[in-house]
Amino acid sequence: ALDTNYCFRNLEENCCVRPLYIDFRQDLGWKWVHEPKGYYANFCSGPCPYLRSADTTHSTVLGLYNTLNPEASASPCCVPQDLEPLTILYYVGRTPKVEQLSNMVVKSCKCS
Amino acid sequence: ALDTNYCFRNLEENCCVRPLYIDFRQDLGWKWVHEPKGYYANFCSGPCPYLRSADTTHSTVLGLYNTLNPEASASPCCVPQDLEPLTILYYVGRTPKVEQLSNMVVKSCKCS
């Protein structure tokens, strides 16, 4: 699987999950998030050669087409597969609130 | 929606579904498919600027991050959203068989 366990331990050029730290205030302008100050959102990048973690029949077909037609511009793209939530603390005035934000952290990638 | 109705009628540079005709024999080397000879598989391509048909919270966050940090290499990618099956005819010896291949045709795209 193209997950953090594999991708963070290997120098992988092809489609893999990459570490990306986002500071809420500096990078997003989100002043309302109190804690954490930032988090590892991660992202997916790298080429999708034929049969690499293909998501659907279409991505397999497109990968094969691309292999047999190297000049073609159509190829699968490396995108998130598994995402996890992030728990944050914010304030409503002086009252603290805890919220779970869904689909915030990329754990693995696929070729789609 | 970034679907064929919209994308095939507009000269859209950003993420959209593009027409792609695949000839089973010539492009894939699939001699076993008798009919059709080929089909419009289509594909997704184009930049994913901030807020364009974002798939998840993560892709919206990544798009916002990319907007506020233009030098960043992390950005969402244009990939298939809705896929449709394709019905094909093939032969097992002299016996014709009809099969529905799932997820063969891209109908719309998203930024993921």
């Epitope: 997003l28 309302w32 914010y90 304030y91 005035g93 002086r94 919220e99 | 807020l51 919270t57 966050v61």
Partner: antibody, heavy 120, light 108 residues
């Protein structure tokens, strides 16, 4: 700089609903927290609630809970305020405003206002 | 909810004079949860002061805010003709956000 453009005036019957839109220009829609404030003719300002785009966390004034829904559509950089079970005392100018960044905060940019008239 | 009481209800002054507007909260707001707005007829409110004493961008330095706890003041050091309007205080320490009933500043 944020610009907030609201939908046009509405005339509604008692018991019906109204949905007012507020479109933000500029690239930082999802960095803003949007509040809704109303002002009855000749009266003061009254906060109804607010929303954090992207994550769709909404907070409402208790007296409007169950009657008001505030949502955000990131794809169009638009926030909506829907008020149901309208009565004559809901006749007011409804404003959207972006806060300085917190859920409850001062409001630095305001829409032009939308007059909602409730009359039978 | 926190009730904000503004005084006076109406203030009649001449251009060039000093205006002092008061806002009293029914419970302590600390030192940084109060804002002041100016509103003219047919217009949306305009933020003047936030955090009790910080001027919003583009606001002339004749406007200043002070106070903490329950007592806050907006001072306009030297009134200009365009300053005659209605002024509201707003608290954002607790939900719901509340506004004072307003002080009308009129030309004497």
């Amino acid at each position: 700089q944020v610009q907030l453009v609201q939908s046009g005036a509405e005339v509604k019957k008692p018991g019906s609903s109204v949905k007012v839109s507020c479109k933000a220009s500029g690239n930082t829609f999802s960095s803003n927290v949007i509040s809704w404030v109303r002002q009855a003719p000749g009266q003061g300002l009254e906060w109804m609630g607010g929303v954090i785009p992207i994550v769709d966390i909404a907070n409402y004034a208790q007296r409007f809970k169950g009657r008001v829904t505030i949502t955000a559509d990131e794809s169009t950089s638009t926030t909506y305020m829907e008020l149901s079970s309208l009565r004559s005392e809901d006749t007011a100018v409804y404003y959207c405003a972006s806060t300085l960044g917190l859920v409850l905060d001062a409001m630095d940019y305001w829409g032009q206002g939308t007059l909602v008239t409730v009359s039978s | 909810e926190t009730v904000l009481t503004q005084s006076p209800g109406t203030l009649s002054l001449s251009p060039g004079e000093r205006a002092t507007l008061s806002c009293r909260a029914s419970q302590s707001l600390g030192s940084s949860y109060l804002a002041w707005y100016q509103q003219k007829p047919g217009q949306a409110p305009r933020l003047l002061i936030y955090g009790a004493s910080s001027r919003a961008p583009g606001i002339p330095d004749r406007f200043s805010g002070s106070g903490s706890g329950t007592d806050f003041t907006l001072t306009i050091s030297r009134l200009e003709p365009e300053d005659f309007a209605v002024y509201y205080c707003q608290q954002y320490a607790d939900s719901p956000i509340t506004f004072g009933q307003g002080t009308r500043l009129e030309i004497k």
